[in-house]
C-alpha cells in the first residue's frame, strides 16, 4: 500500500518555456519498484484544479483545470525510473508561476517547487548586408519576449562600445506578443570577428560571424537563463 | 483494459507501399512512446522505430533507410505505420507495441509481398 | 548497433522449475533492457522493462536483474502456461536490437 510515513527526495530544476512550442517541467524522485504504487500531482501556485496527476500507470485527469486540458502529459514509461517531468503542449505566457511536483510512493512522499518563466527566445543569424552602401552586418532572430537588449561585440576591438554604430529594432509579429529583432552594425572590417548578443530574463543568445576575404563563417548559440 | 486494436492482413506487389493503423484504448494515447516491431516467419524481432503521440516526433531504424513513416492521429487515438517501395522479404507480421509499462501489444498484422 | 547475444537459445524444464535466462548487450545500454514473452502464433507480451520493473499485470514469479552489459531474466515457479519463446531487447541507443531468443520447452 501506499505509505506516508517517510519522506522521500523529489528535486526539480527551474526552466523556461518558449510560448508556441512545446515546454519541459523537469522533476525526479526516488523510484518505487511498483508503477501501481506511484503517485505524481503537479500543482499551479493560484490555480484551483491540478496541472496534471498521473496514478497506477495513468493520468487522473478528472480534477484537471480547464487552462491545461489537453495540454500535459508525463513520460509515463519514465514514471518507473523516477522521472515525473511535466510536458506541457503549446505553452502559453499565462504558463509561468510556481509549480510544485508533489509524488507519493510506497516509500513515502515529497514534494518541491520550480519556478516556470515564459517568453519567447531564439537563434539569431548575422549576415553581411550587401544592399548597404558601406560593410554592414545585419543580425536577426525572428522571436523575442519581453522585449531584449541587443549588444555588439569585436574580437580585435574587445571592450569597444559600438551603440553608436548600430541600429536596432524590434517589429511585432503577427500574433501580437513576440516580436523580430534586427540590428545592423556599420563601418565593419574585414578579417574580424563580431558577435550579435541577445538577452532578456529568460534567454540568451549569440550569432557570431567572421569575413574574411575568401569566406564568411557564422556560428550561433542560446543558453537558458534558469533562475536559481 | 489497455487494448491496442490493429488494421487486417494486407497481400501486396512488390514496389507497393502498405499503410497498417493500431487504434489505442484505455490510457492516455498522449503519454506513452508507440513502437512498431516485425517479425518475419522464423526470425527474431526486428524494431523498426517509434512515434510520441505527444508531439509527433518520430525516431526510426536507419535499416529501412526512408522506407518507414510513422504518424499518429491523436483525435482517434491511432497511430500508424507505412512501409513503402515493399520487396519480398517485407514480409512480415508487424505489431504496434508498447517497450514500457503496459504488457499488452497489438495483435499483429500480417503483410505479405508477392507477385 | 548494439548486439544483443542471448542464451541459452532453448532450454526443457519442468513445471516449478527455476529458470534463469541471461542477455549479454555489446557495449553498455545501463538498464534500458526489455524482456517479452511469445507463444507461437501470437503478439509478444512485454514482461519487464528497464530491466528490473514489471509489466503492467504480469505475474511476481518473472523477475529482472542486471545493469550494464548482463542482464537476467528469472522465472522462479515455472507454469505451464510459461512454456514460450523469450526475448530481450535493448532501448538505449537507436537502433534498438531484440536478442534471438530463448525458447523454454517441456521436459
Known amino acids: 500500500g501506499i505509505s506516508g510515513r517517510h519522506s522521500i527526495t523529489v528535486t526539480t530544476v527551474a526552466s523556461a518555456g518558449n510560448i508556441g512550442e512545446d515546454g519541459i517541467l523537469s522533476c525526479t524522485f526516488e523510484p518505487d519498484i511498483k508503477l501501481s504504487d506511484i503517485v505524481i500531482q503537479w500543482l499551479k501556485e493560484g490555480v484551483l484544479g491540478l496541472v496534471h496527476e498521473f496514478k497506477e500507470g495513468k493520468d487522473e485527469l478528472s480534477e484537471q483545470d480547464e487552462m491545461f486540458r489537453g495540454r500535459t502529459a508525463v513520460f509515463a514509461d519514465q514514471v518507473i525510473v523516477g522521472n515525473a517531468s511535466l510536458r506541457l503542449k503549446n505553452v502559453q505566457l499565462t504558463d509561468a508561476g510556481t509549480y510544485k511536483c508533489y509524488i507519493i510512493t510506497s516509500k513515502g512522499k515529497g514534494n518541491a517547487n520550480l519556478e516556470y518563466k515564459t517568453g519567447a527566445f531564439s537563434m539569431p543569424e548575422v549576415n553581411v548586408d550587401y544592399n548597404a552602401s558601406s560593410e554592414t552586418l545585419r543580425c536577426e532572430a525572428p522571436r523575442w519576449f519581453p522585449q531584449p537588449t541587443v549588444v555588439w561585440a569585436s574580437q580585435v576591438d574587445q571592450g569597444a562600445n559600438f551603440s553608436e554604430v548600430s541600429n536596432t529594432s524590434f517589429e511585432l509579429n503577427s500574433e501580437n506578443v513576440t516580436m523580430k529583432v534586427v540590428s545592423v552594425l556599420y563601418n565593419v572590417t574585414i578579417n574580424n570577428t563580431y558577435s550579435c548578443m541577445i538577452e532578456n530574463d529568460i534567454a540568451k543568445a549569440t550569432g557570431d560571424i567572421k569575413v574574411t576575404e575568401s569566406e564568411i563563417k557564422r556560428r550561433s548559440h542560446l543558453q537558458l537563463l534558469n533562475s536559481k | 483494459q489497455v487494448q491496442l486494436v490493429q488494421s487486417g492482413a494486407e497481400v501486396k506487389k512488390p514496389g507497393a507501399s502498405v499503410k497498417v493503423s493500431c487504434k489505442a484504448s484505455g490510457y492516455t494515447f498522449t503519454s506513452y512512446y508507440m513502437h512498431w516491431v516485425r517479425q518475419a516467419p522464423g526470425q527474431r524481432l526486428e524494431w523498426m522505430g517509434y512515434v510520441d503521440p505527444f508531439n509527433g516526433g518520430t525516431s526510426y531504424n536507419q535499416k529501412f533507410k526512408g522506407r518507414v513513416t510513422i504518424t499518429v492521429d491523436t483525435s482517434s487515438s491511432t497511430a500508424y505505420m507505412e512501409l513503402s517501395s515493399l520487396r519480398s522479404e517485407d514480409t512480415a507480421v508487424y505489431y504496434c507495441a508498447f517497450i514500457a509499462g503496459f504488457a499488452n501489444w497489438g495483435q499483429g498484422t500480417l503483410v505479405t509481398v508477392s507477385s | 548497433d548494439i548486439q544483443m547475444t542471448q542464451s541459452p537459445s532453448s532450454l526443457s524444464a519442468s513445471v516449478g522449475d527455476r529458470v534463469t535466462i541471461t542477455c549479454k548487450a555489446s557495449?553498455?545500454?545501463?538498464?534500458?533492457l526489455s524482456w517479452y514473452q511469445q507463444k507461437p502464433g501470437k503478439a509478444p507480451k512485454t514482461l519487464i522493462y528497464y530491466a528490473t520493473s514489471l509489466a503492467d499485470g504480469v505475474p511476481s514469479r518473472f523477475s529482472g536483474s542486471g545493469s550494464g552489459t548482463d542482464f537476467t531474466l528469472t522465472i522462479s515457479s515455472l507454469q505451464p502456461e510459461d512454456f514460450a519463446t523469450y526475448y530481450c531487447?535493448?532501448?538505449?541507443?537507436?537502433?534498438?536490437?531484440f536478442g534471438g531468443g530463448t525458447k523454454v520447452e517441456i521436459k
Open positions: 531487447l535493448q532501448h538505449g541507443e537507436s537502433p534498438y536490437t
Open positions: 557495449q553498455d545500454i545501463k538498464s534500458y
